[in-house]
């Protein structure tokens, strides 16, 4: 018989994890299980328990993480990876919306994220969402345009920003925006 | 909220003894090294001691093997330098570090990680 099925992986309450907070890792595969491991890619680095609980969040933390269990001698297959993010390791952007954070429901609004230091990455956040704001095939960039704004798109925004080199070393997020469609 | 907490430094003349130890507050720790780092004014700071948790293996550096020895207590989160026939040169300020995650390095390896880290304890050792 062929591998067993990949367990889930996840990050409690988020993966999103400001410096010094507390954040647990947790991997589930079916009841009965022998064994987890859970390692953090690109490292040397991994525990043989399904939880990791961080109690205040730290740089070298910051990474890959995946997990896999095992059952007399058969192994899973490795469950998707989980971003683990530190945030907050530098100074907060500024978001903006032009022409306006207020705008017509077809109109078009751009929000821009910008940062004093040479940053060559950003992320936008709705609130709500579980995941980035993402545009096809580029989704970190300093400008965000929605074309045809309607009304799901009112909410509010956050952006971070933060460096290529170092991808899970995170600003502080931006002063949120509240994008108003009416 | 996790933190180390040093203590036991001071001034002691040379070939004499101190014993610095380390304990760890906060929510639920756990760790799979606990280490002792030290930095000298003007220098990098350098790996001193370690001991894992599980098994209680111990590490040194070169440098200070046969005179200091590395211990846990009898709770889970604390552990001891016992620095015997001093020298000038241990004087430094000495850190306890400790790591979350297990390592397919052993804790005395440069690649190895340490995720937490006290203020430091001076020690000062006068000839």
């Known amino acids: 018989s062929g591998p067993l099925p990949k367990p889930s992986l996840q990050a409690l309450p988020s993966s999103l994890v400001p410096l010094e907070k507390p954040v647990t890792l947790r991997c589930q595969g079916p009841p009965g299980v022998d064994l987890y491991r859970l390692e953090k890619l690109s490292s040397s680095r991994y525990q043989d328990q399904a939880v990791l609980f961080i109690p205040a969040m730290k740089r070298s933390l910051a990474g890959r993480y995946r997990c896999s269990y095992q059952n007399g001698s058969l192994w899973s297959l490795p469950s998707d990876q989980l971003e683990l993010v530190a945030t907050g390791v530098f100074a907060k952007p500024s978001l903006s919306a032009q022409p306006g954070p207020a705008v017509s429901s077809g109109g078009d609004v751009t929000l821009q994220c910008q940062t004093r230091y040479g940053f060559d990455q950003f992320a936008l956040y709705k609130e709500g969402d579980p995941a980035p704001y993402k545009n096809p095939e580029r989704w970190y960039r300093a400008s965000f345009p929605i074309i045809t704004v309607t009304a799901a798109h009112s909410g509010t925004y956050r952006c971070y920003s933060f460096s290529s080199r170092d991808p899970y070393l995170w600003s502080a997020p931006s002063d949120p925006l509240e994008l108003v469609v009416t | 909220q996790v933190q180390l907490q040093e203590s036991g430094g001071g001034l002691v003349q040379a070939g004499g003894s101190l014993r610095l130890s380390c304990a760890a507050s906060?929510?639920?720790?756990?760790?799979?090294?606990m280490g002792w780092f030290r930095q000298a004014p003007g220098k990098e700071r350098e790996f001193v001691a370690a001991i894992r948790w599980s098994g209680g293996s111990t590490y040194y550096a070169d440098s200070v093997k046969g005179r200091f020895t590395i211990s846990r207590g009898n709770a889970k989160n604390t552990v001891y330098l016992q620095m015997n026939s001093l020298k000038p040169e241990d004087t430094a300020v000495y850190y306890c570090?400790?790591?979350?995650?297990?390592?397919?390095?052993?804790?005395?390896?440069?690649?190895?990680?340490?995720?937490?880290w006290g203020q430091g304890t001076q020690v000062t050792v006068s000839s």
């Open positions: 570090a400790s790591s979350l995650l297990n390592s397919y390095y052993p804790p005395d390896h440069t690649s190895y990680e340490y995720d937490y």
């Open positions: 906060g929510r639920t720790f756990s760790s799979d090294a």
